[in-house]
Interface confidence: low
């Protein structure tokens, strides 16, 4: 329960706080769990304990392991565990999942990205910020204290943001980097029960035998980015992919966002070489999201030849 995962990169500073808290006056002893060896408190050591903090200055891959901290008071002892993993530096730009801190969301009104774990370090402004490994430049980006502010946030601002700063310990400087994902949400967004714009309920679609026919299922789900929204066709209550008729396929239409901001999806059902038996099927346009499912049913009828008699 009182275990904390911590990670860092080789040759960078890493500072870990004991997961068990206590008053500043309480003593904290640190041990390397695998050997039960006490971690020294002398600052001349590369790895040393400083009260509730365990400092790797700098960290090495071999430091990886579980560290035990015991908070001692006159009346009780509390034990915590720090699971520390030190990784080799990546040669490419990609930051793997295991080095990522928690994802944060922003919007037009609130676009602060806090630099993770920075409060544990002795650092001085300014922070350096990078997005997808590129240094951030331009007036839209402002490094302010321990966070980055992005003005006029757009969906394109989503991505992985890395903060870089210098930790100072007794006059020696150590680099620290930390990366987290930033997602952009539409502040004005909302979600509705799906509204199917086409086809109309119980619509009869006229088709010609031997020709191709297209049916479009179009539905809107609200405004802004929608969570778990989909449109699809079913034949006699069966998914197209499971129905097993290669002449009948569904194809993703364009994701639409109209001038009023509505988020809509299209799914086109393509029937090649329409056959008599296709007229017997029930075609269901389904639109679903977290609010529920709406279904509009279509049937096909043979297009009558033009009657030339008066």
């Amino acid at each position: 329960k009182f275990s904390k995962q911590s990670w860092g990169l080789e040759n960078e500073a890493l500072i870990v706080r004991c997961p068990r808290q206590g008053k500043p006056s309480y003593t904290v002893d640190w041990y390397y769990s695998q050997t039960n060896k006490s971690i020294p408190t002398q600052e001349r050591n590369r790895v040393f304990a400083s009260g509730q903090l365990l400092k790797f200055l700098p960290a090495a891959v071999a430091d990886s392991g579980i560290y035990t901290c015991i908070v001692r008071s006159p009346t009780f002892n509390r034990t915590g565990y720090a699971n520390v993993t030190i990784y080799k530096k990546q040669s490419d730009c990609n930051v793997p999942d295991y080095l990522m801190y928690s994802t944060v969301s922003g919007s037009e009104k609130n676009s602060k990205i806090y630099c993770p774990t920075i409060d544990l370090y002795n650092w001085t402004a300014p922070l350096e910020w990078f997005k997808n490994c590129q240094a951030l430049q331009g007036s839209r980006y402002r490094a302010h204290k321990s966070f980055l502010v992005i003005d006029n946030v757009m969906t394109e601002d989503a991505g992985d943001y890395t903060c870089k700063f210098i930790h100072n310990e007794n006059g020696a400087n150590y680099s620290v980097t930390a990366t987290r994902s930033f997602t952009v949400k539409d502040e004005q967004g909302f979600s509705l029960f799906p509204v199917i714009g086409a086809p109309a309920q119980n619509e009869i679609k006229e088709v010609e035998i031997g020709k191709n026919a297209n049916l479009t299922c179009s539905a809107c789900f609200g405004k802004g980015t929608q969570f778990l929204a989909a449109v699809l066709w079913q034949l006699n209550g069966t998914k197209i992919t499971d129905f097993g008729e290669p002449r009948i396929q569904q194809e993703e239409g364009q994701n639409q966002s109209f001038s009023n901001g509505l988020a809509c999806l299209d799914m086109v059902l393509r029937i090649a070489d329409v056959k008599e038996e296709d007229l017997l099927l029930q075609y269901d346009c389904l639109a679903l999201n977290l609010h529920g499912l709406r279904r509009h049913t279509v049937r096909l009828s043979r297009k009558n030849p033009i009657d030339h008699h008066s």
């Epitope: 991505g159 929608q226 989909a230 998914k239 194809e251």
Partner: nanobody, 122 residues
Framework: ESGGGSAQAGGSLRLSCTAS??????????MGWFRQAPGTGREAVAT????????YYADSVKGRFTISQDNAKNTMYLQMNSLKPEDTAMYYC??????????????????WGQGTQVTVSS
């Protein structure tokens, strides 16, 4: 991910990616395959929405690569045929729960795999 490795130009490989969690959750994920060659940015290869079986492909792989899934196993596959040397890259699978951005232009996914290397020699 698994299934990476080396292949000759014109050969085939099949990558697989298994998502932990319930089948209910898996079927509602937008899932994608990405690749990143040394010194280049990450590019989308193919994306899929298992719940309705709809797929998208990058122009560079259309007709050669096929994305599919086994909903019972919570697993997504990328069948790569007619491989070319320019397909050499680290391949990543990704998953996200935001559907209406599930397309080949989507790059911000909540969950990423560790990557598997694909090397195609001429």
């Amino acid at each position: 991910e698994s299934g990476g490795g080396s292949a000759q130009a014109g050969g085939s490989l099949r990558l697989s990616c298994t998502a932990s969690g319930s089948g209910y959750f898996y079927s509602r994920l937008c899932m994608g395959w990405f690749r990143q060659a040394p010194g280049t940015g990450r590019e989308a290869v193919a994306t899929s929405y298992p719940g309705i079986g709809s797929t998208y492909y990058a122009d560079s792989v259309k007709g050669r690569f096929t994305i599919s899934q086994d909903n019972a196993k919570n697993t997504m596959y990328l069948q790569m045929n007619s491989l070319k040397p320019e397909d050499t890259a680290m391949y990543y699978c990704a998953a996200d729960a935001t559907w209406n951005t599930c397309g080949i232009t989507k790059t911000t996914y909540a969950y990423w795999g560790q990557g598997t290397q694909v090397t195609v020699s001429s």
